[in-house]
């Protein structure tokens, strides 16, 4: 006949306060005859958790019908778990004896521990915007989890990042733990639509990790490129000059025209368009009056982007003699 084995398959059982815990125990043989009891702890101080034959165990129910003749499943459920239930639980086989049963074999024990889910990760980016090619730091924090073992990963647009440092506190034993990770991300010019993701995996999440995200649009500043051009066609005695402000982010932009150093207050036509990568283009048209008195006209398009120092582009207006003549003809 095969030797009796007491099988407690879970070495660790994570439970949540208030919930029901199921402690598994099966035997491989019906012999020797005698009951199976459950204990918390070992030695003379151990606590009796369940005895099918006698006693009062209001929070304990059996998974199987222990009265069935060939039952080999002695698993139990303990309801309304509290922190005081933490400990190691043993199912123990007793051999029927006279006058008393004798302890025969114990299972290896199942450690009941309190599990607590981590909070949703919160990702925070830098306080100030940074331009492409520079490195920015993102932090991710999650709190309140137990046990201490936890896995944290960083992604940028689905690609895993490797440049990060993670700390779990406290280092010693605690009821609950916190994780903080800082990732360093190099900004690309097209990162306006990019995301960084902090992913936290923990045993209490049953394979469904928690994610926190941050948009790189909050961290990036893409400075504009400026181009000022003169339109070949003119309208009457006016020449159209265009200032194209390309590929900038964020949208915050102030554009001013000046003519020979004098800021022009008058309204100008403009359009704003959004590019596929999330950056913007701004086009401003400026109409310059052409007259005999104006041989040298220098136009400046000045752009102040997102509170940064102004950048400008100049254009010396090219007015041909023919254009001047036409302009003079038009003057009464």
């Amino acid at each position: 006949e095969e030797e009796l084995q007491m099988i407690q398959p879970e070495k660790l059982l994570l439970v949540t306060v208030g919930k029901t815990a199921t402690l598994h125990c099966t035997v491989t043989s019906l012999l020797p005859v005698g009951p199976v009891l459950w204990f918390r702890g070992v030695g003379p101080g151990r606590e009796l958790i369940y005895n099918q034959k006698e006693g009062h165990f209001p929070r304990v129910t059996t998974v199987s019908d222990l009265t069935k003749r060939n039952n080999m499943d002695f698993s139990i459920r303990i309801s309304s778990i509290t922190p005081a239930d933490v400990g190691t639980y043993y199912c123990v086989k007793f051999r029927k004896g006279s006058p008393e049963n004798v302890e025969f074999k114990s299972g290896p024990g199942t450690e009941m521990a309190l599990g607590a889910k981590p909070s949703a990760p919160v990702v925070l980016g830098p306080a100030a915007r940074t331009t492409p090619e520079h490195t920015v730091s993102f932090t991710c924090e999650s709190h309140g989890f137990s046990p201490r073992d936890i896995t944290l990963k960083w992604f940028k647009n689905g690609n895993e990042l490797s440049d990060f440092q993670t700390n779990v506190d406290p280092t010693g034993q605690s009821v609950a733990y916190s994780i903080r990770s800082t990732a360093r991300v190099v900004l690309d010019p097209w990162d306006v639509r990019s995301q960084v993701i902090c992913e936290v995996a923990h045993v209490t999440l049953q394979g469904d990790p928690l994610r926190g995200t941050a948009n790189l649009s909050e961290a990036i500043r893409v400075p504009p490129t400026l181009e000022v051009t003169q339109q070949p066609m003119r309208v009457g005695n006016q020449v159209n000059v265009t200032c194209q402000v390309r590929k900038f982010y964020p949208q915050s932009l102030q554009l001013t025209w000046s003519e020979n150093g004098n800021v022009c207050q008058r309204e100008t036509a403009s359009t704003l368009t959004e590019n596929k990568d999330g950056t913007y283009n701004w086009t401003s048209w400026f109409l310059v009056n052409i007259s005999d008195q104006r041989d040298d006209v220098v136009l400046t398009c000045q752009v102040k982007h997102d509170g940064q120092l102004a950048v400008s582009k100049r254009l010396a207006l090219e007015v041909t003699v023919h254009q001047k003549d036409q302009s003079s003809d038009a003057t009464p």
Epitope: K11, L12, R40, G41, V42, G43, P44, G45, R46, E47, L48, I49, G55, H56, F57, A84, V86, G87, T88, E100, E111, A113, P147, R148, G172, Q173, S174, V175
Partner: antibody, heavy 118, light 114 residues
């Protein structure tokens, strides 16, 4: 709520005997290991003895082995400590304590003072 | 037997200030198989029995104010009272239940108000 009430303390001469009792209520007494812990006047705590939930197993600190015996009567929800051959160094407040698993002591009685003096 | 040594023996702290009590074990009370520290803390006020404060090194007993916290692992443990109240005047004991019997206690730390 859990209550542990000790009795049986008093003044006794060296070499004599005393039996302490602890009546338990508010929990299922027969499911728990129980302990005696003592505290000499102005001193710290010293564990004295433990008995299993069913009374079949017990252990004592070396200094009282062979002189003290822990026992219980689950039908009366009562824990006992039989103290024989008492010595002056046994003078202490004796507390009965409920074990939580085989681990810590989650409830304590108010204690009973035993004074061994000639 | 495992010997627990507490420090300091006594401690005077102003009301509202932090009190820190240390407990050092002569051998580890960390069970490597379950990563649990088999250590408890008790509070004993004058003329009263001890009262369980902390078990498994860091779990607060039900009803214990959250100004009490336990930390540490292996052989070095700390009980912290984050903001001392008048009612916290007592003797505090650590206790191990890793290697039993015997259950052993530290010698106690007396906490008073400065």
């Amino acid at each position: 709520q859990v209550q542990l009430v000790e009795s049986g303390g008093g003044v006794v001469q060296p070499g004599r005997s005393l039996r302490l009792s602890c009546v338990a209520s508010g929990f299922i007494f027969s499911n728990y290991g129980m302990h005696w812990v003592r505290q000499a006047p102005g001193k710290g705590l010293e564990w004295v003895a433990v008995i299993s939930y069913d009374g079949r197993n017990e252990d004592h600190v070396d200094s009282v082995k062979g002189r003290f015996t822990i026992s219980r009567d689950n039908s009366k929800n009562t824990l006992y400590l039989q103290m024989n051959s008492l010595r002056a160094e046994d003078t202490a407040v004796y507390y009965c304590a409920k074990g939580s698993g085989s681990y810590y002591f989650d409830y304590w009685g108010q204690g009973t003072l035993v004074t061994v003096s000639s | 037997d495992i010997v627990l040594t507490q420090s300091p023996d006594s401690l005077a702290v102003s009301l509202g200030e932090r009190a820190t009590i240390n407990c050092k074990s002569s051998q580890t009370v960390l069970n490597s198989s379950n990563n649990k520290n088999y250590l408890a803390w008790y509070q004993q006020k004058p003329g009263q029995p001890p009262k369980l404060l902390i078990y498994w090194a860091s779990i607060r007993e039900s009803g214990v104010p959250d100004r009490f916290s336990g930390s540490g692992s292996g052989t070095d443990f700390t009980l912290t009272i984050s903001s001392l109240q008048a009612e916290d005047v007592a003797v505090y004991y650590c206790q191990q239940y890793y290697n039993t019997p015997p259950w052993t206690f530290g010698q106690g730390t007396k906490v008073e108000i400065k």
